[in-house]
């Protein structure tokens, strides 16, 4: 039975040209995390694998930094980055947990952050 839950940074907004940290946290399970995937809609952004470390997809290499923690930092944001992002935790023996974050990239300088982790 899957007992875990994923907390995410929820709906967040950021300014065009700026950067944002996407964070998820898996809690309430003793399952071992073997890999965390970060995806944007159907595109793979990055993987953090227990044995192999971080892999950033070539098309995002210049704009995506691994971390902090199991999170992901998106840099040089464009309006096209607006959309859904998913953290997918692969665990043993539970299976897969998925968290969703919606990012809105704003043109103006009045972007305000929604609910966020205190860990940036």
């Amino acid at each position: 039975m899957m007992t875990g839950t994923i907390e995410t940074t929820g709906n967040i907004s950021a300014e065009k040209g700026g950067s944002i940290i996407l964070q998820c946290h898996l809690s309430s399970t003793t399952a071992q995390v073997t890999q965390v995937n970060w995806e944007q809609q159907d595109q793979l952004l990055a993987i953090c694998n227990a044995d192999l470390g971080w892999h950033i997809s070539p098309s995002f290499k210049d704009r995506v930094a691994p971390g902090p923690g199991l999170g992901l930092t998106l840099q040089s944001l464009t309006v096209n980055d607006t959309g859904e992002y998913f953290c997918i935790y692969h665990t043993y023996p539970d299976g897969t947990y998925t968290g969703r974050i919606f990012l809105e990239v704003l043109e103006s300088s009045v972007a305000e952050h929604g609910a966020r982790f205190q860990i940036p």
Epitope: H25, S27, T34, W54, H55, P66, P68, G69
Partner: antibody, heavy 117, light 107 residues
Framework: QVQLQQSGAELVRPGTSVKISCKAS????????LGWVKQRPGHGLEWVGD????????NYNEKFKGKATLTADTSSSTAYMQLSSLTSEDSAVYFC??????????WGQGTLVTVSA | DIKMTQSPSSMYASLGERVTITCKAS??????LSWYQQKPWKSPKTLIF???RLADGVPSRFSGSGSGQDFSLTISSLESDDTATYYC?????????FGGGTKLEIK
């Protein structure tokens, strides 16, 4: 298996600089953050900063900005830490370490830096 | 910066005794906490990562618990080889910070 081999002890003069190294083997160097930790005799552990060789990203403890510079040479799988304007306060053992949230941390054997006139 | 308050700073315990060391973060760090053992003139050794996960090769008498702000390292039955200094480390955001250490000695 993962190994981090650090350079040997250094005896350096106050006001000068020193560059110590950490050669990684047994894993893909560009895929993991590599950090540096300071330990003065009789003191605890202090995090200096870390570097992600795959993109050159760095994080520094504010206290060590301007003191430590972290670099990495991916061709030789070696990370470096340069310490500048050395004083007696910089005399310490410096450890390199490799970690992820998913596997824990591997440590180098430490490099003793002694600053003395 | 997040401050890690570790206690006790030193302690004596008897062989076979259950020993608990605690670390308190100044704010929520989720599960981004590791525990290390260090012996004199040696590199630290990872015991626990991600708050509760036992590192490879570490005896099962060591365990970690907690999340958020309060964490603990427990040795279920103390052995002579456990004489060392123990440190916690939070690694969820830069700068990472260590606890002050706990020096554990045998009575």
């Amino acid at each position: 298996q993962v190994q981090l081999q650090q350079s040997g002890a250094e005896l350096v003069r106050p006001g000068t600089s020193v560059k110590i190294s950490c050669k990684a083997s047994g894993y893909t160097f560009t895929n993991f953050w590599l950090g540096w930790v300071k330990q003065r005799p009789g003191h605890g552990l202090e995090w200096v900063g870390d570097i992600f060789p795959g993109g050159g990203y760095t994080n520094y403890n504010e206290k060590f900005k301007g003191k430590a510079t972290l670099t990495a040479d991916t061709s030789s799988s070696t990370a470096y830490m340069q310490l500048s304007s050395l004083t007696s306060e910089d005399s310490a053992v410096y450890f390199c370490s490799r970690s992820t949230m998913l596997t824990g941390t591997y440590w180098g054997q430490g490099t003793l830096v002694t600053v003395s006139a | 910066d997040i401050k890690m308050t570790q206690s006790p700073s030193s302690m004596y315990a008897s062989l076979g005794e259950r020993v608990t060391i605690t670390c308190k973060a100044s704010r929520d760090i989720k599960s981004y906490l590791s525990w290390y053992q260090q012996k004199p003139w040696k590199s630290p050794k990872t015991l626990i990562f991600y708050a509760t996960r036992l590192a490879d090769g570490v005896p099962s008498r060591f365990s970690g618990s907690g999340s958020g702000q309060d964490f603990s390292l427990t040795i279920s039955s103390l052995e002579s080889d456990d004489t060392a200094t123990y440190y916690c480390l939070h690694h969820g955001e830069s700068p990472y910070t260590f606890g002050g250490g706990t020096k554990l000695e045998i009575k």
